[in-house]
């Protein structure tokens, strides 16, 4: 939200030098008027009258939806995930037709043992969530399954998930190489055919805060940018204070136009201010400049 500037007069001067009489300035080109019943309200920029006030669309606000917000809410997901489609061949269980039926006792027991085995294999991976068998087929038992990974959203989430998928590949390759049958017997929880291990596909959550910011900023997309604070992305215009990209309007008010952020300089009883950043003050009585 914009901070109000205590001034003794209501006039604002744009940094180009023209005096503007009202603080709420219509700086947007697209104007639509919403009329409901007898109530005529100038709800601009796609806003609509709800019977009491204008309901504005992002990124607009104000009585008539004529002003542009300084920041837009973007909500990255709490967590991001990856799904790896893998195939392994289990040799310590012989295939039977009942394994194709996911509600059979055979499938349930196989699923229990397989899940226990995979939980052991991936126990050192913090992103590991679990496995989900998608299909069982002959040979001894070819297990098509998904390995599910999840991590908290951070700007580096893709790297974290990419690293985790690499560790999954290493661990499944290791276990299916080491846990093999000897004389048709398996001494491990499960034994595997080393050559049957394949990674079919990897899908990683796609989330781009910059893209979401640009989409929500609509025609102001070139002037809104993403900055991070405590690993959380903020979609801001230069008029939002407290960020690296914040515009300092000194003795003025920052306002967005379709040409970007500009400063509207204040005029007080003693001074008028000018300059791109409203940092040039002129004393009214003495006409003396000070910086």
């Amino acid at each position: 939200p914009l901070a109000t500037i205590p001034v003794s007069t209501t006039s604002l001067t744009s940094s180009e030098g023209s005096t503007i009489s009202t603080p709420s300035v219509d700086i947007s080109t697209p104007v639509t008027t919403s009329i409901v019943g007898d109530q005529c309200s100038r709800c601009k920029n796609g806003g609509f009258w709800d019977g009491l006030k204008c309901q504005c669309l992002t990124p607009y606000y104000g009585e008539s939806c004529e002003e542009v917000v300084n920041s837009i809410d973007i909500a990255p997901p709490e967590t991001v995930s990856a799904q790896m489609e893998l195939t392994v061949t289990v040799t310590s269980v012989k295939f039977t037709d009942e394994l194709k039926n996911h509600s059979s006792q055979e499938f349930r027991e196989f699923n229990k043992t397989f899940t226990e085995q995979m939980n052991i294999v991936y126990s050192g991976i913090p992103e590991y969530v679990g496995v989900n068998i998608t299909n069982l087929r002959l040979g001894s038992v070819v297990v098509e399954h998904d390995v599910l990974l999840r991590t908290k959203y951070t700007p580096e989430y893709k790297t974290a998930l990419d690293n985790a998928t690499e560790v999954v590949k290493q661990k499944i390759t290791k276990v299916t190489t080491e846990q093999i049958m000897t004389n048709d017997n398996c001494s491990a929880l499960m034994c595997f055919n080393t050559t049957g291990t394949q990674v079919q596909n990897i899908t990683v959550t796609q989330y781009d805060p910059v893209e979401e910011c640009r989409q929500k900023a609509e025609e102001y997309e070139d002037y809104f940018l993403v900055e991070y604070r405590d690993q959380k992305p903020y979609c801001i215009s230069p008029c939002e204070s407290g960020f690296n990209a914040s515009k300092n309007c000194n003795h003025g008010k920052c306002q967005m136009s379709q040409n970007g952020a500009r400063c509207l300089c204040v005029t007080t009883e003693t001074h008028w201010y000018s300059g791109e950043d409203c940092n040039q003050g002129t004393q009214k009585s003495h006409h003396h400049h000070h910086h």
């Epitope: 310590s92 055979e106 043992t113 049958m181 017997n185 001494s187 929880l189």
Partner: nanobody, 123 residues
Framework: EVQLVESGGGVVQPGGSLRLSCAAS????????WGWFRQRPGKEREAVAL???????FYADSVKGRFTISQDNSKNTLYLQMNSLRAEDTAMYYC?????????????????WGQGTQVTVSS
């Protein structure tokens, strides 16, 4: 839910014989796997004799030629005939079963267990 109940354990002199039985209520497991495991004092549970519905059998090296596993599907019962018993055969013997056709000696892969029957070989 499948229940397995062992019987036939007891005290026997070295060189003697015992026949353990395991009666199953519920599923017959004629299509799966059956097995006998034992746990000696202070040791982990180990596979003694295992059998699967496709004809696979396993015997621990220490019991080969002395123990025989068999099953009677009509009675829903698994047997372990133990001959030439030794002091080192003293253990709690457990019956185990699975609907899966297994090839594994690892007890964690077996989902159904009896309460066990004690076998003590002592002079």
């Amino acid at each position: 839910e499948v229940q397995l109940v062992e019987s036939g354990g007891g005290v026997v002199q070295p060189g003697g014989s015992l026949r353990l039985s395991c009666a199953a209520s519920g599923d017959t497991f004629s299509r799966g796997s059956w097995g006998w495991f034992r746990q000696r004092p202070g040791k982990e549970r180990e596979a003694v004799a295992l059998i699967s519905s496709d004809g696979w059998t396993f015997y621990a090296d220490s019991v080969k030629g002395r123990f025989t596993i068999s099953q009677d599907n009509s009675k829903n019962t698994l047997y372990l005939q133990m001959n030439s018993l030794r002091a080192e055969d003293t253990a709690m013997y457990y019956c185990a079963a699975s609907v899966l056709v297994l090839r594994t000696l690892n007890p964690k892969a077996w989902h159904h267990w009896g309460q066990g029957t004690q076998v003590t070989v002592s002079s």
